[in-house]
């Protein structure tokens, strides 16, 4: 699993010792101020309401297993979804729906109605993004489930649609 | 009014004295690198295109009061709402507006129209959201007008319709 | 060029020496925990497919130049775009697609289809964001794609089109 | 008490140079923005320049552009108009106003105080 | 440039009357709109902010509304310190604007 992560980072580092023990800007560096976050494209073949994402996106103090992102650190999480629909209108409008949930329950969701019309088009495209902030103890999960999941378009658009988390402010 | 906060918050922690003195990870950790931010969802009642919101959210270096959260440190935040509507389409298209204001100024607003087709349909779901990053200055107050409040749907989806703000970069 | 910025910034002042050395206060106050941010709204006139924007704008620790925000320091950035458009609805469906470039490779998209009902409509409204996490090096550029940009609503609503970054964690 | 005292005003010839102050009192002057509007003899207001409370956003009227310079010492409670090339058009009565906000990011928000303005006559 | 245009440029009116003047801007300004009062030889006075908030001060007989491009400021009953030459002003983007002016004189 690739863990794209910013170079340096002060994790684990001890403040004391060594030759930074007198140098402030050292210490500073190394400082406590921890850091974590996640941004993952959803995988390219879906077969179910709970999304799955490619492992190999960006993964910096939060672990991917089963759909969920897994909360490593503590703290205050800006948490962001956005997924793009491509939509083959039936005879009726759709109800596109995205579900943001932690620890398996619904915090948050969207919802947009297509194909209003009840025509039968070529295409509609709809954007639908979902964000929360709230606070996450360690292990928690953050999992996305979409009941429509056969019009998120994986395949023009393979970059579009992804779950990101940053944490805002940790509880040390 | 509860504030759900971060426990040990650093306010107002004298950087000097105590068993703290010698210790540059203690001193590190009580460092004045102040967070503020606030997550309220829409108050259930709505009567009034200014919107109310539940006093028992997240608050945390900011205060709530008559619709409007207010600022209490400088420095530039990102500022964030999010509703969910539901319209029962009349005979003529409905334009969705939501407007976010500072200081009674609308700095920012997003439209959307739905029911385009003119046709009456049981429902139609819309999703609108407006973000900012804005400089507040303290006693400065955030707050949303919504001209088409009676769509904000605050039964079926209770917790979708949120306002946040979290700093981002104070001005010590 | 306007780079309205926060007062006091800590960029490039020394930790040690002067009155500073033995006041902890004081040195973590000048500590090197850099921010970097742009927020720029779109010109008024434009004339191609890659948008302009207003350089009197906030830009601190970012350069414009030429419709790209370019990146001063390295670290993991947070980048949101937002329009709002404006279609006067042809007889035919109307694909609205915002382009987020990262030195001038698409790196995420968003569309949404209006004019579905393929009724000559007085006017629809449509709001569409797009937001990115990555990694940006110094002389990164970001830059923003609309087709449709005769549709971006820049009279009605003149603070509503905006381009933001935020630097969410540095190299250091 | 808001005060706003303007200062500087006079007769002059066409293409010499003034210079204007404002003395404000009774606020926390570095956490406003702050502007110069101009009334010529007869005529309506004119908005002439504007500088956010940390000087990073400054614009003028196009009818001074390039010879009207806006600043401010946050430290001594002043803001200035350094006044080129001056020209007949140019006479009016110049009051300082204070803005309601900071001018960061388009933050103006109306002008709440004025000063009772200086006169500045150009003829030869 | 946002150009702004009040109408009427005068008007005469009588005390207790109910005064309305209009100010339409040349492009969209949201709510980011003032008006103020001025009478012969004196600074003007700030009336009005956000289009529709009074300043601190003003009689409540003064309100404004609009939003966008049309604005209105109404005096429900003209008081005799009521007459003066009101302006209104955007704020929105450089360069700030007023209009032209509405000169309110006695009937």
């Known amino acids: 699993q690739r863990t794209d992560s910013i170079p340096n980072s002060p994790d684990n580092i001890p403040l004391r010792g060594g030759n930074c023990s007198e140098d402030l800007l050292c210490i500073l560096k190394r400082a406590p101020f921890k850091k974590s976050w996640a941004y993952l494209q959803v995988a390219k073949h879906l077969n179910k309401t709970k999304l799955s994402w490619n492992k190999d996106g960006i993964l910096h103090g939060v672990r991917y297993q089963d759909g969920n992102l897994v909360i490593q650190f503590p703290g205050l999480y800006f948490i962001i979804c956005q997924l793009q629909f491509l939509v083959q209108c039936p005879n009726n409008s759709v109800d596109l729906k995205l579900e943001l949930l932690i620890n398996k329950h619904i915090k948050k969701q969207a919802l947009v109605t297509v194909c209003e019309s009840g025509m039968q088009t070529k295409h509609v495209y709809q954007n639908l993004s979902q964000f929360l902030l709230d606070y996450l103890q360690v292990n928690t999960t953050v999992s996305v489930n979409v009941d429509t999941f056969q019009y998120i378009d994986t395949s023009t658009f393979p970059l579009e649609n992804v779950l990101s988390v940053f944490l805002y402010s940790n509880s040390d | 009014q509860r504030t759900d906060s971060i426990p040990n918050s650093p306010d107002n922690i004298p950087l000097r004295g105590g068993n703290c003195s010698e210790d540059l990870l203690c001193i590190l950790k009580r460092a004045p690198f102040k967070k503020s931010w606030a997550y309220l969802q829409v108050a259930k009642h709505l009567n009034k295109t200014k919107l109310s919101w539940n006093k028992d959210g997240i608050l945390h270096g900011v205060r709530y009061q008559d619709g409007n959260l207010v600022i209490q440190f400088p420095g530039l935040y990102f500022i964030i709402c999010q509703l969910q509507f539901l319209v029962q389409c009349p005979n003529n298209s409905v334009d969705l507006k939501l407007e976010l204001l500072i200081n009674k100024h609308i700095k920012k607003q997003a439209l959307v129209t739905v029911c385009e087709s003119g046709m009456q349909t049981k429902h139609v779901y819309q999703n609108l959201s407006q973000f900012l990053l804005d400089y507040l200055q303290v006693n400065t107050t955030v707050s949303v007008n919504v001209d088409t409040f009676q769509y904000i749907d605050t039964s079926t989806f209770p917790l979708e319709n949120v306002l946040s703000v979290f700093l981002y970069s104070n001005s010590d | 060029q306007r780079t309205d910025s926060i007062p006091n910034s800590p960029d490039n002042i020394p930790l040690r020496g002067g009155n500073c050395s033995e006041d902890l206060l004081c040195i973590l106050k000048r500590a090197p925990f850099k921010k970097s941010w742009a927020y720029l709204q779109v010109a008024k006139h434009l004339n191609k497919t890659k948008l302009s924007w207003n350089k009197d704008g906030i830009l601190h620790g970012v350069r414009y130049q030429d419709g790209n925000l370019v990146i001063q320091f390295p670290g993991l950035y947070f980048i949101i775009c937002q329009l709002q458009f404006l279609v006067q609805c042809p007889n035919n469906s109307v694909d609205l697609k915002l382009e987020l470039l990262i030195n001038k490779h698409i790196k995420k998209q968003a569309l949404v289809t209006v004019c579905e009902s393929g009724m000559q409509t007085k006017h629809v409204y449509q709001n569409l964001s797009q937001f990115l996490l990555d990694y940006l090096q110094v002389n990164t550029t970001v830059s923003v794609n609309v087709d449709t940009f005769q549709y971006i609503d820049t009279s009605t609503f003149p603070l509503e089109n905006v381009l933001s970054v935020f630097l969410y964690s540095n190299s250091d | 008490e808001v005060q706003l005292v303007e200062s500087g005003g006079g007769l002059v010839q066409p293409g010499r140079s003034l210079r204007l102050s404002c003395a404000a009192s009774?606020?926390?002057?570095?956490?406003?923005?702050m502007h110069w509007v101009r009334q010529a003899p007869g005529k309506g207001l004119e908005w002439v320049s504007g500088?956010?409370?940390?000087?990073?956003?400054?614009g003028y009227a196009d009818s001074v552009k390039g010879r009207f310079t806006i600043s401010r010492d946050n430290a001594k409670n002043s803001l200035y108009l350094q006044m080129n090339s001056l020209r007949a058009e140019d006479t009016a009565l110049y009051y300082c106003?204070?803005?309601?906000?900071?001018?960061?990011?388009?933050?103006?928000?109306?002008?709440?105080?004025w000063g009772q303005g200086t006169l500045v006559t150009v003829s030869s | 440039d946002i150009q702004m245009t009040q109408s009427p440029s005068s008007l005469s009116a009588s005390v207790g009357d109910r005064v309305t003047i209009t100010c339409r801007a040349s492009?969209?300004?949201?709510?980011?709109l003032a008006w103020f009062q001025q009478k012969p030889g004196k600074a003007p006075k700030s009336l009005i902010y956000?289009?529709?908030s009074l300043q601190s001060g003003v009689p409540s007989r003064f309100s404004g509304s609009g939003s966008g491009t049309d604005f209105t400021l109404t005096i429900s009953s003209l008081q005799p310190e009521d007459f003066a030459t009101y302006y209104c002003?955007?704020?929105?983007?450089?360069?700030?604007?007023f209009g032209g002016g509405t000169k309110v004189e006695i009937k």
């Open positions: 106003a204070k803005d309601k906000g900071i001018g960061f990011n388009w933050n103006y928000e109306g002008f709440d105080y």
């Open positions: 009774g606020f926390n002057f570095d956490d406003y923005a």
């Open positions: 500088i956010s409370w940390r000087s990073g956003n400054i």
């Open positions: 492009q969209g300004i949201s709510n980011h």
């Open positions: 956000a289009a529709s």
């Open positions: 002003q955007q704020y929105v983007t450089y360069p700030l604007t």
